[in-house]
Interface confidence: medium
């Protein structure tokens, strides 16, 4: 999906008001310094691409993020503020239902959510030069 035509300010507002809290709640008890940010993004569409990938695509050691509160709110924000996004997700959602696993918070998931926090921070600061 091409995120170029999303309403970035509306997505940012959704992040600042709710998604950020849910990410903090998920990471509660984990020091942010435990993980190095290895995933980066260069502009807002790129950031949303990376955020979608880390949030919804199962990875080795972390298959369960899509059912977390921050993920559901991220999905809702993208569906509302990115034209045509919902349609592209129908097949992906059906595939996910077939391989649903019980929620387990692993260290790998914590690391992944730490990366997500960094991507969201970058999304919110589009005028900053890339580090």
């Amino acid at each position: 999906y091409d995120f170029t035509n999303c309403d970035f300010e509306k997505i940012k507002a959704a992040y600042l008001s709710t998604i950020s809290k849910d990410l903090i709640t998920y990471m509660s008890g984990t020091k942010s310094t435990e993980f190095n940010n290895t995933v980066s993004c260069s502009n807002r569409p790129h950031c949303l691409t990376e955020i979608q990938s880390l949030t919804f695509n199962p990875t080795a050691g972390c298959a369960s993020l899509a059912k977390e509160m921050f993920a559901m709110k991220t999905k809702a924000a993208l569906a509302i503020w990115c034209p045509g996004y919902s349609e592209t997700q129908i097949n992906a959602t059906q595939a996910m239902k077939k391989r649903r696993k019980r929620k387990v918070t692993t260290n790998k998931c914590l690391e992944q959510v730490s990366q997500l926090q960094g991507l969201w921070r970058r999304f919110n600061r589009p005028l900053l030069k890339q580090q």
Epitope: K12, A13, L16, S17, S20, I24, T25, M27, S28, G29, T30, K31, S32, T33, R121, N124, R125, L127, L128
Partner: nanobody, 127 residues
């Protein structure tokens, strides 16, 4: 649940002082590299950033309008950030909010991104 609760506001005469507190629950300031800041919104005006403290190195930032009068500090053992406000002026009258997940050094204090999580605390400066 993740929450921020602001307190310490009230009615004070011009030239007086107040200390605002921002207490976090549901998460620990010290565990994150989020910066924490204070904002205010006066009746009929836009929200504006007042001050910010970096959770990485303790660096502090102030809006020009409060420099030399306000001091931001934090106490990680109490999970609280404070705003000491001295030499208060009528134009400081506003609802004061604190917020996390902001970025002290990006665009200047006045241009923070933020969304209030708490109800804020009202500061009224009047004789």
């Amino acid at each position: 649940e993740v929450q921020l609760v602001e307190s310490g506001g009230g009615l004070v005469q011009p030239g007086g002082s107040l200390r605002l507190s921002c207490a976090a629950s549901g998460f620990t300031f010290a565990d994150y590299d989020y910066d924490i800041g204070w904002f205010r919104q006066a009746p009929g005006k836009e929200r504006e950033g007042v001050s910010c403290i970096s959770n990485r190195d303790g660096s502090t930032y102030y809006a020009d309008s409060v420099k030399g009068r306000f001091t931001i500090s934090r106490d990680n053992s109490k999970n609280t950030v404070y705003l000491q406000m001295n030499s208060l002026r009528p134009e400081d009258t506003a609802v004061y909010y604190c917020a996390v997940e902001i970025h002290c050094d990006d665009y200047g204090v006045e241009n923070f991104d933020f969304d209030p999580w708490g109800q804020g605390t009202l500061v009224t400066v009047s004789s």
